[in-house]
Amino acid sequence: TCEIVTLDRDSSQPRRTIARQTARCACRKGQIAGTTRARPACVDARIIKTKQWCDMLPCLEGEGCDLLINRSGWTCTQPGGRIKTTTVS
């Protein structure tokens, strides 16, 4: 389970509010850190182990997911054709 935590908020300027957000995720046994719907998430460790990145549903709703060559990451293709590439080190 993950929750978004607001680390600090700068409201010194009335017309502008700046917030730094981070995810706090507590993974269950058999899960490790991953990405689901473009957000930090706990995912099945076997997905990471086998590098079947698209199985963790990393792209936003409506986007298409494809594995990069050698399973080095994935691409998310928007309906308009724009492609976002994520590589895993």
Partner: antibody, heavy 128, light 104 residues
Framework: VTLDESGGGLQTPGGALSLVCKAS????????MFWVRQTPGKGLEYVAE????????NYGSAVKGRATISRDNGQSTVRLQLNNLRAEDTGTYFC??????????????????????WGHGTEVIVSS | ALTQPSSVSANPGETVKITCSGG???YGWFQQKSPGSALVTVI????ERPSDIPSRFSGALSGSTNTLTITGVQADDEAVYFC???????????FGAGTTLTVL
């Protein structure tokens, strides 16, 4: 990666012991940690584990209710407290590391099948 | 409980396979030369090999059974090999009773 256990020795039945594992050579706060023991004539037995950030703990059935595992990420140590000692607690106690490096913002359990490093062990004898 | 054979034997240079089944998540293999002595991980996370372990050691997962293979076994490989994983419910760690490898 180095794991160094201490605190073993001769203990009396009904007493308590505190084992400490000092880690070095890796980012301690990113890894789940384990205590595993080997009792005479037996194989390896899962004793306890703790998540990388210390928020989660789990215990083997033989020590549940008598054991407490804790960690100090600042000092890179993991401790096992075992109360109400019994003769069957006699054995060699090993500290072990789970290989997965949990990223910041995540709390992760280790996995027994992902143990990639062990301490040398510390011997505990429970006898009157 | 995990199931692994109590003993296996082989001549130097032969290939040895030791199986372990009955767990969940990932499997590891741990070598011990004598009771109470140091444990050495030869395989972790199903098929990963620590950098200081010879390439003759390999692991493979098929279903819920993991197989440790030692290709071209050597006299120095004589030891007890324990497998480790999580119990079938995934609530605690569990180890096999150990397989004694004898090199003839």
């Amino acid at each position: 990666v180095t794991l160094d256990e201490s605190g073993g020795g001769l203990q009396t039945p009904g007493g308590a012991l505190s084992l400490v594992c000092k880690a070095s050579g890796f980012t301690f706060s990113s890894h789940g940690m384990f205590w595993v023991r080997q009792t005479p004539g037996k194989g390896l037995e899962y004793v306890a584990e703790i998540t990388n950030d210390g928020s989660g703990t789990n215990y083997g059935s033989a020590v549940k209710g008598r054991a407490t595992i804790s960690r100090d990420n600042g000092q890179s140590t993991v401790r096992l407290q075992l109360n109400n000692l019994r003769a069957e607690d006699t054995g060699t106690y090993f500290c072990a590391r789970s290989t997965y490096e949990c990223p910041g913002g995540f709390s992760c359990w280790g996995d027994t099948g992902q143990i990639d490093a062990w301490g040398h062990g510390t011997e505990v004898i429970v006898s009157s | 409980a995990l199931t692994q054979p109590s003993s296996v034997s082989a001549n130097p240079g032969e290939t040895v396979k030791i199986t372990c089944s009955g767990g969940s998540y990932s499997y590891g293999w741990f070598q011990q030369k004598s009771p109470g002595s140091a444990l050495v991980t030869v395989i972790y996370w199903d098929d990963e090999r620590p950098s200081d372990i010879p390439s003759r050691f390999s692991g493979a997962l098929s279903g819920s059974t993991n197989t440790l293979t030692i290709t071209g076994v050597q006299a120095d490989d004589e030891a007890v090999y324990f497998c480790g994983t999580e119990d079938i419910s995934g609530t605690a760690g569990v180890f096999g009773a150990g397989t004694t490898l004898t090199v003839l």
